[in-house]
Interface confidence: low
């Protein structure tokens, strides 16, 4: 069935910033998709087109991207009469029309909005759930429910505390199924809230953009200690492990790292990549840390390579790879990490996201599907993670509706699959291993 009409509009994301929403119509109905937005964007990712008109939304409007959809992309796709199941053809056509390497003509937010809506329409056209359609597009015969990685303590550039490292996550790998993983996550989260309230006061339990807490702590080890305590209090020491997103590019300073970068600059306290690696190794030894994202700067290739070779844990590339096949190829070649963080808006189309995932998996990497800090009620990534069988998703704490929208959709998918539902559990790094 071909596309009858496409209409885009400006809506708001969870941080109150404009973003793109697309309505796509076929004879089967209306298919709606909204595009997420990152607070920090890597220098190697596809361009999110903003208006830069300071008189409107502090320059963050997306009316240009919306106009590109309504005036250029929509007429082209409607006139081509392409079937909505032809995801690759449609994405390729938009990429070709844009004609730039980083989608800077139309904006990745324009192309992705249409791409997501096409994917949703394609599933209905085939009469299958969205996750099954995505599995087909990826060449997967199985579908798998992921382990959720709940970001429950926030630090880094966007938190008002002194904590250098950006995210401290809990992963309920010992759960029997996704529903139990949600229960464990929620119970640990509420225990953590009480622990923080007792130790740092009620204000410390205000939540950040992704639903996590940002208590005023400086030591990263203290963040891990809080998690260990909350996990223990909830009674899940044997079922929950810890993940971190360090976002080290944020405190990289001329070949060294400043773990106190939120204080006045003092180069004498910077540490070397080797010293930072030793700090991570002490975390791994003292806490159940199984995954570290962006442990080094996005261009500190040597440090990545050395650490990945010497640590037995999952090393996730986000700023390093930005879901970009060329960056992934380099990282694979140099054995820089062993897991890809997959963010659809970093590359800007469903097809390229699937290709990036395939490229990573083909080289034995894990893949973690991720939200962005500026989210909407759209639940596409929940179906994406199931269809791609990546086994892991991070989409915030079990708090804030735009985060729960994804987790709730995963609950529905598990229920729909019934006895056929398979949960990644402790195999979250390689859920399809024979």
């Amino acid at each position: 069935m071909s596309i009858l009409k496409i209409h885009a509009r400006e809506i708001f994301d969870s941080r109150g910033n404009p973003t793109v929403e697309v309505d796509l119509f076929t004879s089967k109905g209306l298919f709606r998709a909204a595009v997420p937005s990152g607070a920090s964007t890597g220098i190697y990712e596809a361009l999110e087109l903003r208006d830069n008109d300071k008189t409107r939304y502090m320059g963050k409007g997306v009316s240009k991207a919306v106009e590109h959809i309504n005036k250029t992309i929509a007429p082209a796709l409607v006139s081509k009469k392409l079937n909505v199941t032809e995801q690759e053809k449609i994405d390729k056509l938009m990429i070709e029309m844009d004609g730039t390497e980083n989608k800077s003509k139309f904006g990745a937010n324009a192309i992705l909005g249409v791409s997501l809506a096409v994917c949703k329409a394609g599933a209905v056209e085939k009469g299958v759930p969205l996750y099954r359609h995505i599995a087909d597009l990826a060449g997967n015969s199985e579908v798998i429910l992921p382990v959720p990685a709940f970001n429950v303590i926030n630090g880094g550039s966007h938190a008002g505390n002194k904590l250098a490292m950006q995210e401290f996550m809990i992963l309920p790998v010992g759960a029997a199924n996704f529903r139990e993983a949600m229960r464990i996550g929620a119970e640990v989260y509420h225990n953590l809230k009480n622990v923080i309230k007792e130790k740092y006061g009620k204000d410390a339990t205000n939540v950040g953009d992704e639903g996590g807490f940002a208590p005023n702590i400086l030591e990263n080890k203290e963040g891990l200690e809080l998690l260990k305590t909350a996990i223990g209090k909830a009674g899940y020491t044997d079922k929950v492990v810890i993940g971190m997103d360090v976002a080290a590019s944020e405190f990289f300073r001329s070949g060294k790292y400043d773990l106190d970068f939120k204080s006045p600059d003092d180069p004498s306290r910077y540490i070397s990549p080797d010293q930072l690696a030793d700090l991570y190794k002490s975390f791994i030894k003292d806490y159940p840390v199984v995954s570290i994202e962006d442990p080094f700067d996005q261009d500190d290739w040597g440090a990545w390579q050395k650490f990945t070779a010497s640590a037995a844990i999952q090393v996730v590339g986000d700023d390093l790879t930005v879901t970009n096949p060329k960056r992934i190829a380099k990282a694979v070649n140099e054995k820089s990490c062993n897991c890809l963080l997959l963010k659809v808006n970093q590359i800007g189309s469903v097809t390229e996201s699937l290709q990036a995932c395939k490229l990573a998996q083909a080289n034995g990497w894990g893949v973690m599907v991720s939200h962005r800090s500026g989210e909407t009620e759209d639940t596409f990534i929940a179906d994406l993670v199931v269809g791609l069988c990546t086994g892991q998703i991070k989409t915030g704490a079990p708090c804030r509706s735009e985060r729960l929208a994804k987790y709730n959709q995963l609950l529905r998918i598990e229920e729909e699959l019934g006895s056929k539902a398979k949960f990644a559990g402790r195999n979250f790094r390689n859920p399809l291993a024979k």
Partner: antibody
Framework: QVQLVQSGAEVKKPGASVKVSCKAS????????MNWVRQAPGQGLEWMGY????????KYNEKFKGRVTMTTDTSTSTAYMELRSLRSDDTAVYYC????????????WGQGTLVTVSS | DIQMTQSPSSLSASVGDRVTITCRAS??????LTWYQQKPGKAPKLLIY???TLPEGVPSRFSGSGSGTDFTLTISSLQPEDFATYYC?????????FGQGTKLEIK
């Protein structure tokens, strides 16, 4: 070093099926996608499809859909390509080719298996 | 499907010559192009990927250029072992398709 060793030549009658094997060594079998490419006598190369041994995901060239099945046996690091309802124009050398670290590049090839379809 | 067209389909040259083979895609494939070398009775060998990158072990006399729809394979100084058939192939999504080949013969 990486090696892909294919099964021997086959002669088949029209309408029959053929199953070609490709045994991989020198690398972790599940870490690379395996493609199949064929070459008719004196002709160019034609991509048939791929299988990802990591998750058994397959993608076939539309031209062969319904006639081709690609499978793997990770315990023996072997990939298989079965082609059904053979016709005389399926006479070709069939190659398995390991996909390099960038998708769509074939950095190692099997020696080829000649399949002759003749009545 | 994306069509790949090579030219010339055959060419004769001498050892030491500089040779250029071109490949045209029916639509924009950015730099998603690979070149292979094939000798009679042998499997193809990867020569260049991503339009211009040489894998380890490929002599530097081989070079690739181009992006979008027009690509070139250049051999700066032909050696006896370079006489073979050369194929281009796009890897901008599936189905991957090959050019019809360019046969390089000794003059």
């Amino acid at each position: 070093q990486v090696q892909l060793v294919q099964s021997g030549a086959e002669v088949k009658k029209p309408g029959a099926s053929v199953k070609v094997s490709c045994k991989a060594s020198g690398y972790t079998f599940t870490s690379s996608v395996m493609n199949w490419v064929r070459q008719a006598p004196g002709q160019g190369l034609e991509w048939m499809g791929y299988i990802n041994p990591y998750n058994d995901g397959t993608k076939y060239n539309e031209k062969f859909k319904g006639r081709v099945t690609m499978t793997t046996d990770t315990s023996t690091s072997t990939a298989y390509m079965e082609l059904r309802s053979l016709r005389s124009d399926d006479t070709a050398v069939y190659y398995c080719a390991r996909e390099g670290f960038y998708y769509g590049n074939f950095d190692n090839w099997g020696q080829g298996t000649l399949v002759t379809v003749s009545s | 499907d994306i069509q790949m067209t090579q030219s010339p389909s055959s060419l004769s040259a001498s050892v030491g010559d500089r040779v250029t083979i071109t490949c045209r895609a029916s639509e924009n494939i950015y730099s998603y192009l690979t070149w292979y070398q094939q000798k009679p009775g042998k499997a193809p060998k990867l020569l260049i990927y991503n339009a211009k990158t040489l894998p380890e072990g490929v002599p530097s006399r081989f070079s690739g250029s181009g992006s979008g729809t027009d690509f070139t394979l250049t051999i700066s100084s032909l050696q006896p072992e370079d006489f073979a058939t050369y194929y281009c192939q796009h890897h901008y999504g599936t189905p991957y398709t090959f050019g019809q080949g360019t046969k390089l013969e000794i003059k």
